[in-house]
Amino acid sequence: GSGIFQLRLQEFVNQRGMLANGQSCEPGCRTFFRICLKHFQATFSEGPCTFGNVSTPVLGTNSFVVRDKNSGSGRNPLQLPFNFTWPGTFSLNIQAWHTPGDDLRPETSPGNSLISQIIIQGSLAVGKIWRTDEQNDTLTRLSYSYRVICSDNYYGESCSRLCKKRDDHFGHYECQPDGSLSCLPGWTGKYCDQPICLSGCHEQNGYCSKPDECICRPGWQGRLCNECIPHNGCRHGTCSIPWQCACDEGWGGLFCDQDLNYCTHHSPCKNGSTCSNSGPKGYTCTCLPGYTGEHCELGLSKCASNPCRNGGSCKDQENSYHCLCPPGYYGQHCEHSTLTCADSPCFNGGSCRERNQGSSYACECPPNFTGSNCEKKVDRCTSNPCANGGQCQNRGPSRTCRCRPGFTGTHCELHISDCARSPCAHGGTCHDLENGPVCTCPAGFSGRRCEVRITHDACASGPCFNGATCYTGLSPNNFVCNCPYGFVGSRCEFPVGLPPSFPWVA
């Protein structure tokens, strides 16, 4: 119920032991009381006790004081609970009866006789203070007090405001004396269901699901989620917004991992070679003649430059070399020929032209062939023309570069942004990283390409009322309530019928 009308009987006086009809009780008036509480009537009439009724056992004989008793038979004050909005007005009928029968259940005894009765009509506000009164007639006097108080969890001037303290998913609050909610520490909002995040937690970049927590959104870190996360792999750089990599002084490249002053800091080039701060590793060594290798660390064989011509073979000698010439050739580099055009010295379809009045010759080579006798096939890939690990392929008179993924251009010199293809679905933000693109997904999506829609259990919040069963899965973010008998509505919120005593009915 929503409230209780309490009546405290204090003293009853019937000194002459008389009944209402003028007869006397023998040996004395064994007195019990009947109480009837009903809605306000200007003139009290018989009829149902609409607000409740109660009877006492025999409390004494003729004149007696009624003591307070908290339990069992003869409880005092008497309790008349109600489960409706207290209207503020009432009618009360207190009757004193004599019984010749059972002390504990005098109501059931035959031969009960009325001693006296009183009727009170008026207004009464809800409150803890007792209203005391005394009623006299020619034979009797009754002293009593009464009040109306709200039941547990009911508040307000008419006990109509239901408030039950809770500390769960639906709210974290206690109830004020007027029934309004008082949030527990760490919670806020109309229903105290919104946590107060850790003090200083960034409003946009952080959030919380319980008090004093600060959970960072993607791209942010730190106790208060106010520090951005730099680009994955960023070595010598910082960020002012997530996934940025702004290089520290002296560093460059996508990941700020290229030392822009490598030559000065590390002196990588050997054997008197020249160092320049450029190239894929941040530096390039230009070797002096006779040296090779990335750092010009390798001394070349004197024959390395292929000084012997016309198929002569080269032999290394200390500080020098020697050419062994094939038949028909002579000179330090086998550069002179004893052959003439009559010997058909030009290979691979080369044309022979006589020189020095026929004492020597020169070959004019067709495309793709070279050498003084057109004996060498031209390899256009020897100069390593393809950058960024591209593969060089000879194709007839020309050559092509087959580029690795992420590069393009004639020499694979152009870097393709992986993000140019817009790989992130559902409005995700793309970031170019060393191992491919990375997507930062908006709320409600996940996966490498933000292709996975995050669904939640729509029944988790307990949306169905009045004991209904909740079902999900019928559509992604939806639920269906299966109502118990007597309720309708999308969340079973409407009772179909309410008996007059139903607690919701004022």
Epitope: N466, G489, R491
Partner: nanobody, 117 residues
Framework: EVQLVESGGGLVQAEGSLRLSCAAS????????MAWYRQAPGKQRELVAG???????HYAESVKGRFTISRDDAKNTVSLQMNSLKPEDAAVYYC???????????WGQGTQVTVSS
């Protein structure tokens, strides 16, 4: 808590029409489910028509095709248009609201509808 005040009740001839209106206080009115109940003397209070949280409507069998419930969230009102009234429709009509997260219900004070034959 939403405060509800009904209006529009009165005396009408059988087969006549009446429009009941319920004005609600509170800025979150649009989130509440709303309904009309009625109670004739000595009978239980019964659901006449309701607008659920998802906007779906529900009617008692005895009023289907004659009564229409509607709401105007801009004006914080819910209305019940009653056509082809019958003597058995006479009762006190109550406005009822349901809180979206607690399920607690609030009642208006009621408005009397009398149908004379």
């Amino acid at each position: 808590e939403v405060q509800l005040v009904e209006s529009g009740g009165g005396l009408v001839q059988a087969e006549g029409s009446l429009r009941l209106s319920c004005a609600a206080s509170g800025s979150t009115f649009s989130t509440y489910a709303m309904a009309w109940y009625r109670q004739a003397p000595g009978k239980q209070r019964e659901l006449v028509a309701g607008i659920s949280f998802d906007g779906s409507t529900h009617y008692a069998e005895s009023v289907k095709g004659r009564f229409t419930i509607s709401r105007d969230d801009a004006k914080n009102t819910v209305s019940l248009q009653m056509n082809s009234l019958k003597p058995e429709d006479a009762a006190v009509y109550y406005c009822y609201s349901v809180h979206p997260s607690t399920g607690f219900g609030s009642w208006g004070q009621g408005t009397q509808v009398t149908v004379s034959s």
